[in-house]
């Protein structure tokens, strides 16, 4: 039986060029944490297995870093990078888990305020 | 219904070898990564080896580095573990399990015992 719960870092915005921290947590379990797979869509960006380490994708090795923890860091953040991002917690003996996050990324700042400024 | 099926385990005296063999049937979703796991009696389930699909990237726990070897068939839906100088510390149940972007499936295990 699945007890589990996910709790992640929800909807979130940042700057293009900046960067950001995916965060998922997987409570109420005594379950064993085998993998965690992050996905964007249906891209594969990396692997933690909790034995074996990080696996990064290669198409993401130059913009996506691991951590903190179990967490995932993408980094030089495009507009290309708004939607949906899955934490796929991989447990024995319970099952898989998902959480999901969506994350836009927004125009800088100096643009955003440009963009208001009114001529009188 | 998934369905992955090991075999190749068996009694073996320290020193030899053994190929473990892991098929696979009825994957629904897109193939992450293959891997094998062994359980020693009292012991947790632990990660020796991985392959992941996208680049074909291997992965070894400390405990089997340069004595173990992780491949994979994609045609034949095949991961295999080629074990050499086996030592009684590798006693075990072998698992071998993969990741799909949908979960993830195990078989039902191998017994490797090394005897000295």
């Known amino acids: 039986m699945m007890t589990g719960t996910i709790e992640t870092t929800g909807n979130i915005s940042a700057e293009k060029g900046g960067s950001i921290i995916l965060q998922c947590h997987l409570s109420s379990t005594t379950a064993q944490v085998t993998q965690v797979n992050w996905e964007q869509q249906d891209q594969l960006l990396a692997i933690c297995n909790a034995d074996l380490g990080w696996h990064i994708s290669p198409s993401f090795k130059d913009r996506v870093a691991p951590g903190p923890g179990l967490g995932l860091t993408l980094q030089s953040l495009t507009v290309n990078d708004t939607g949906e991002y899955f934490c796929i917690y991989h447990t024995y003996p319970d099952g898989t888990y998902t959480g999901r996050i969506f994350l836009e990324v927004l125009e800088s700042s100096v643009a955003e305020h440009g963009a208001r400024f009114q001529i009188p | 219904e998934v369905q992955l099926v090991e075999s190749g385990g068996g009694l073996v005296q320290a020193g030899g070898s053994l190929r473990l063999s892991c098929a696979a049937s009825?994957?629904?979703?897109?193939?992450?990564?293959m891997g094998w796991f062994r359980q020693a009696p009292g012991k947790e389930r632990e990660g020796i080896s991985l392959i992941t699909s996208d680049d074909g990237s291997t992965y070894y726990a400390d405990s089997v580095k340069g004595r173990f070897t992780i491949s994979a068939d994609n045609a034949k839906n095949t991961v295999y573990l080629q074990m050499n100088s086996l030592k009684p510390e590798d006693t075990a149940v072998y698992y071998c399990?993969?990741?799909?972007?949908?979960?993830?499936?195990w078989g039902q295990g191998t017994q490797v015992t090394v005897s000295s």
């Open positions: 399990a993969w990741t799909t972007n949908r979960g993830m499936d």
């Open positions: 009825g994957i629904i979703g897109t193939i992450r990564t």
